[in-house]
Amino acid sequence: DGNSTRSPETNGLLCGDPEENCAATTTQSKRKGHFSRCPKQYKHYCIKGRCRFVVAEQTPSCVCDEGYIGARCERVDLFY
């Protein structure tokens, strides 16, 4: 079995639900901690949006461009 430390990195994306709008979800999560520049390795993570790094969780999160939704801002919002 693995070691038993607890995670700073939940890796459950703040805008992780495919049905949620990343921008909205991330905005709601501001109370959880601040954001920093995404590590370079996540440069291509957000498809139609901006990546930012959740400091408290050490994981990337996408802020979608208008009209896009999804964990990676990969889908057009048909209701936009």
Partner: antibody
Framework: EVQLLESGGGLVQPGGSLRLSCAAS????????ISWVRQAPGKGLEWVSY????????NYADSVKGRFTISRDNSKNTLYLQMNSLRAEDTAVYYC?????????WGQGTLVTVSS | DIQMTQSPSSLSASVGDRVTITCRAS??????LGWYQQKPGKAPKLLIY???SLQSGVPSRFSGSGSGTDFTLTISSLQPEDFATYYC????????FGQGTKVEIK
Amino acid sequence: EVQLLESGGGLVQPGGSLRLSCAASGFTFSRYWISWVRQAPGKGLEWVSYIDSWGSYTNYADSVKGRFTISRDNSKNTLYLQMNSLRAEDTAVYYCARGGSLFDYWGQGTLVTVSS
Amino acid sequence: DIQMTQSPSSLSASVGDRVTITCRASQGIISYLGWYQQKPGKAPKLLIYAASSLQSGVPSRFSGSGSGTDFTLTISSLQPEDFATYYCQQYDALNTFGQGTKVEIK
């Protein structure tokens, strides 16, 4: 209790293939990025690959790019590493670890030996 | 690729000693750095993340500092269970580890 259990290691000839599995329990697997990290005998740690929680985003170390493929089945709480065109230098203990940037839980590893 | 260089590669110390391990990145990585401890035959254990944040459950005698290219792991008072190999890892560009520092009993 978080647990990661690797399997599928063994002896394989150069040029051969192997598929490793990592069974996860004790946490919501589908919410987490997961990685493979390897360690050659008596050597240091080398990150191999990661996959995001949805299985839609992957990255690989240059040393394995084009030969290894990471995937996951969230319905089975299982991570995979398909290894093709294996080389002697791929001989290592392969760990699955929770996280994409940092690795907070690790399995105990499975040994892959590439030799003729 | 970003190279991570640890020094020293090994050191001998006694229980109660203050131990410092350094890690240098070949280019700036802000504070995207973690430290791990590994004992023989065991999986690594995360000690420090974001250069200076202590992982939950890790004793406070461990601390990390630095940003940019130069980083330090300090063990304020070495305990018997601290004899192990320590690795730094950057996660700005694709994840890479240092070569390790083995802390042995003097």
